[in-house]
């Protein structure tokens, strides 16, 4: 008899697994782009915003050529975990203004969680070492003001958008090397 209903399919084709991760990443990228646009529309951004607690961008045009699958998946998972925590923090801490975008932020957080699970599954199927247990997460400080939390939201969505954009490119490139 085959595997019990509902159990994960054990794939013998890592390319198919990678495809599925790319699709999820692409979908999340589209969601993030849309939400970032909504944010800009609702709360116009006065220039670029940064948040020290966000991960630095792991990939760039210069590093695409030397990408290795284990490194990319590990780093991507660690960075997306950080963005997941930031979105979670934003939903709980940012004040009433951002509650108007609560359905979208909630959906974004759920999709991020789904992608994180997919990446973890992909790493185990490819027999890649799981990312070392995350360093104890540095608690995210309270926003200094409502205005500060809106700036933080712009920074989080902007950073996540860039990270996902590079992730799609990187994963597609790695797929051709498998």
């Amino acid at each position: 008899p085959g595997p019990p209903a509902g159990s994960p399919r054990v794939s013998s084709d890592p390319r198919a697994d990678l495809d599925s991760a790319v699709l999820l990443t692409r979908s999340l990228l589209a969601d993030t782009r849309q939400l970032a646009a909504q944010m800009r529309d609702k709360f116009p951004a006065d220039g670029d915003h940064n948040l020290d607690s966000l991960p630095t961008l792991a990939m760039s045009a210069g590093t695409l050529g030397s990408l290795q699958l284990p490194g990319v998946l590990t780093r991507l998972r660690v960075d997306l975990m950080s963005y997941f925590r930031h979105v979670q923090w934003l939903r709980r801490a940012a004040g009433p203004s951002l509650k108007t975008l609560e359905p979208e932020l909630g959906a974004l957080q759920a999709r991020l969680e789904r992608l994180l699970r997919r990446l973890q599954l992909l790493m185990s199927r490819l027999a890649l070492p799981q990312a070392a247990p995350d360093q104890p997460a540095v608690p995210l400080g309270p926003p200094a003001s409502a205005w500060g939390s809106i700036r933080a939201a712009h920074a989080i969505l902007g950073g996540l958008h860039l990270t996902l954009d590079w992730a799609v490119r990187g994963l597609l490139l790695l797929k051709t090397r498998l």
């Epitope: 609702k42 709360f43 939903r91 709980r92 801490a93 940012a94 004040g95 009433p96 203004s97 509650k99 108007t100 609560e102 309270p142 926003p143 200094a144 003001s145 409502a146 205005w147 500060g148 939390s149 809106i150």
Partner: antibody, heavy 117, light 111 residues
Framework: QVQLVESGGGVVQPGRSLRLSCAAS????????MHWVRQAPGKGLEWVAV????????FYADSVKGRFTISRDNSKNTLYLQMNSLRAEDTAVYYC??????????WGQGTLVTVSS | QSVLTQPPSASGTPGQRVTISCSGS????????VSWYQQLPGTAPKLLIY???LRPSGVPDRFSGSKSGTSASLAISGLRSEDEADYYC???????????FGGGTKLTVLG
């Protein structure tokens, strides 16, 4: 230092209107969401309304929805609460409070509104 | 009837540790941060705890907050006579789209 000073309270008849003001100083008023919270004599705290830092988003307690309007003038560093169709149960001390997120880090001293015929 | 449930009263003797509970639901305490306020007789409330367990500067470390699931609690250790006051818990409620408070707990310091 941060200061919030409410004014405009007094005795008013049921069905009439009153406008409360809250003058803010000691911080960048336009960066903060602002709330009104009230406390009936001998009772607990009851949240009334909040307005976002730039004034576009407003939320109200069900008990005041459609009767009260929260507004702000960032150029004057002032928060307002327009109270219409007042009822006896609106009698309370009204506090304005500043919030960086969902907690109130500074409160005014309060202004008493008495609705009585 | 308050959305968040607190015991109406609590008491202790100087030096004792007292805990005040605050019970809510998944739409408030379960998904948002809890804050606690102290209101001395005849004065405006004062922020004691925010973000579930953080203390603003100036609040003694005798006061601590914690949260688990849909309940939160405020602990006061080394009770002092000046701690006699009303204590309120609060959180945003996603279902009501507003802030909710507990009914308040009157703390009496005996002796």
């Amino acid at each position: 230092q941060v200061q919030l000073v409410e004014s405009g309270g007094g005795v008013v008849q049921p069905g009439r209107s009153l406008r409360l003001s809250c003058a803010a100083s000691g911080f960048t008023f336009s960066h903060y969401d602002m709330h009104w919270v009230r406390q009936a004599p001998g009772k607990g705290l009851e949240w009334v309304a909040v307005i976002s830092y730039e004034g576009s988003n407003k939320f109200y307690a069900d008990s005041v929805k459609g009767r009260f309007t929260i507004s702000r003038d960032n150029s004057k560093n002032t928060l307002y609460l327009q109270m219409n169709s007042l009822r006896a149960e609106d009698t309370a001390v009204y506090y304005c409070a500043r919030t960086p997120g969902f907690h109130f880090d500074y409160w005014g001293q309060g202004t008493l509104v008495t609705v009585s015929s | 009837q308050s959305v968040l449930t607190q015991p109406p009263s609590a008491s202790g003797t100087p030096g004792q540790r007292v805990t005040i509970s605050c019970s809510g639901s998944s739409s408030n305490i379960g998904s948002n941060y809890v804050s606690w306020y102290q209101q001395l007789p005849g004065t405006a409330p004062k922020l004691l705890i925010y973000y579930d367990d953080l203390r603003p500067s100036g609040v003694p470390d005798r006061f601590s907050g914690s949260k688990s699931g849909t309940s939160a609690s405020l602990a006061i250790s080394g009770l002092r006579s000046e701690d006699e006051a009303d204590y309120y818990c609060s959180a945003w409620d996603d279902s009501l789209s507003g802030v909710v408070f507990g009914g308040g707990t009157k703390l009496t310091v005996l002796g």
